[in-house]
């Protein structure tokens, strides 16, 4: 019963949390103009990962994508990739872990593939999650970059030097909206993977071998349950997510230091 | 299209509040407009006043601040500008206008001369 | 607040000719979000309330002739009338839109010579 609630609450959580990373991939306000010095001001901008926003005092708001490619910065085709990515890992580990949950019947699939499904859904999570809070966390590390490289710009009119302060960005809702998201997702996943312990009866994972001796009925089982589940010293199995970051060296199609445990 | 129409009194005594109503017709004033006050003082230039949002938020300009309070009657489809402890100087012609895009102000109501004298 | 500076006060033209009206705000008008300039340009005729001419400093408002124009950036702006009409006569206000409080450019007032 406490597996069956562990997995259905790490589903819930991680439902809410990717539709949370859509939302926040999909919001404007990943950036909001600084109004520090002007808490009212007549135009006030705003920007996504898609489009930039101006919000004038009389109430007229105008949209502008960002209708090149090319010409966006790096970071911000990094944050994309790293939201977009986490909401396809996410989607497909919803769709995984519906089939997997225990509450739900299709066939007859046994404990030990709804087990693997569901921890497949928790890494799926798990991964989901940490590419949010990633892409966020880059996101807001480049907010906090350009606000002190912002300081007094100068504009010069054909009477002379007229001084503007040039206009600095804060954290949007998005960010905040992005972290929760991520770390929703990333207990969720968590979840699953608690849940799958639960989820593969001893019986059902290995054969028990009797052994019959002269006046007595013994059953001895060998490995017990660390040898077939893959939580214990299976090597195969152990490696269940690199979190670490990469150089771009790093990155090789064969084998690196990364993908042995 | 929006339509705007000024009332008051004409004549009003120092130290004491003017109180005019601009009448919206033609649209809604919680609409997505900034609803605002403005005055041109007799052969001079105009002077903005403040303004209530259609979520009826408002913003004064710093220099009459301590004296105006702008109001809305959505029932009636109506504002108000009520300015306190006038002078000679307040003497002009009120207008109410609404602002939108480029925050320009796009309609003008005729405009209400109001005189300060005792 | 920002300063709004037109000039001339007064303008006598003759019909059919080009009018310029000048107009200098003490700080930009220009909002980097969307690189367009906050300034707005009215005409005001005789008895009657201001009309709305430009926004944006060079976007017309709709039924305005395509004689007026406006163009400019930062802080310094112009309002072309290309070919003086007889109904242009009327007083001319600049506006900054950009930063409270909304503040306007004393008139410039354009005549027939």
């Known amino acids: 019963m406490a597996v069956t609630a562990c997995q259905g609450l790490g589903f819930v959580v991680s439902l809410i949390g990717i539709a949370g990373i859509i939302a926040a991939t999909c919001m404007d306000q990943w950036s909001t103009q600084d109004l520090y010095n002007n808490p009212v001001t007549a135009v006030f901008n705003y920007q996504g990962l898609w489009r930039s926003c101006v919000r004038e005092s009389s109430g007229f708001t105008e949209c502008r994508g960002y209708f090149t490619l090319l010409g966006l910065p790096a970071m911000l085709q990094a944050v994309r990739a790293l939201m977009i990515v986490g909401i396809v890992l996410g989607a497909i580990g919803l769709l995984v872990s519906i089939f997997a949950l225990k509450c739900i019947r299709i066939g007859s699939m046994e404990d030990s593939a709804k087990a693997n499904m569901t921890l497949t859904s928790g890494i799926m999570f798990i991964v989901s999650g940490l590419c949010a809070i990633a892409g966020v966390s880059v996101f807001a590390n480049m907010l906090v970059t350009n606000f002190w490289m912002s300081t007094a710009n100068m504009y010069t009119g054909m009477g002379g030097m007229v001084q503007t302060v040039q206009t600095r960005y804060t954290f949007g809702a998005a960010l905040f909206v992005g972290w929760v998201a991520g770390g929703l997702t990333l207990i969720g996943g968590v979840m699953m993977c608690i849940a799958c312990r639960g989820l593969a009866p001893e019986e059902t994972n290995y054969k028990a071998v009797s052994y019959h001796a002269s006046g007595h009925s013994v059953a001895y089982k060998p490995g017990g349950f660390k040898a077939s589940t893959g939580f214990g010293s299976n090597t195969k199995n152990k490696k269940i997510y690199d979190g670490g970051a990469r150089t771009e060296d790093e990155v090789q199609s064969y084998p690196s230091k990364h993908d042995y445990v | 299209q929006v339509q705007l129409q000024e009332s008051g009194p004409g004549l009003v005594k120092p130290s004491e509040t003017l109180s005019l109503t601009c009448t919206v017709s033609?649209?809604?004033?919680?609409?997505?407009?900034?609803w605002n006050w403005i005055r041109q003082p007799p052969g001079k230039g105009l002077e903005w006043i403040g303004y209530?949002?259609?979520?009826?938020?408002?913003n004064y300009n710093p220099s009459l601040k301590s004296r105006v309070t702008i109001s809305r009657d959505t029932s009636k489809n109506q504002f108000s500008l009520k300015l306190s402890s006038v002078t000679a100087a307040d003497t002009a012609v009120y207008y109410c206008?609404?602002?939108?895009?480029?925050?320009?102000?796009?309609?003008w109501g005729q405009g209400t001369l109001v005189t300060v004298s005792s | 607040d920002i300063v709004m500076t037109q000039s001339p006060d007064s303008l006598a033209v003759s019909l059919g000719e080009r009018a310029t009206i000048n107009c200098k705000s003490s700080?930009?008008?220009?909002?980097?979000?969307?690189?367009?300039?906050?300034l707005t340009w009215y005409q005001q005729k005789p008895g009657q309330p201001p009309k709305l001419l430009i926004y944006?400093?060079?976007t017309r408002e709709s039924g305005v002739p395509d004689r007026f124009s406006g163009s400019g950036s930062g802080t310094d702006f112009t309002l072309t009338i290309s070919s003086l009409q007889a109904e242009d006569v009327a007083v001319y206000y600049c506006?900054?839109?950009?930063?409270?409080?909304?503040?306007f450019g004393q008139g410039t007032k354009v005549e027939i010579k």
């Open positions: 209530i949002y259609y979520s009826g938020n408002t």
């Open positions: 700080q930009s008008l220009l909002n980097s979000g969307n690189q367009k300039n906050y």
């Open positions: 033609g649209g809604s004033i919680s609409s997505n407009y900034a």
């Open positions: 944006w400093a060079s």
């Open positions: 506006q900054n839109a950009y930063s409270f409080p909304w503040t």
């Open positions: 206008a609404t602002s939108y895009y480029g925050n320009s102000f796009i309609y």
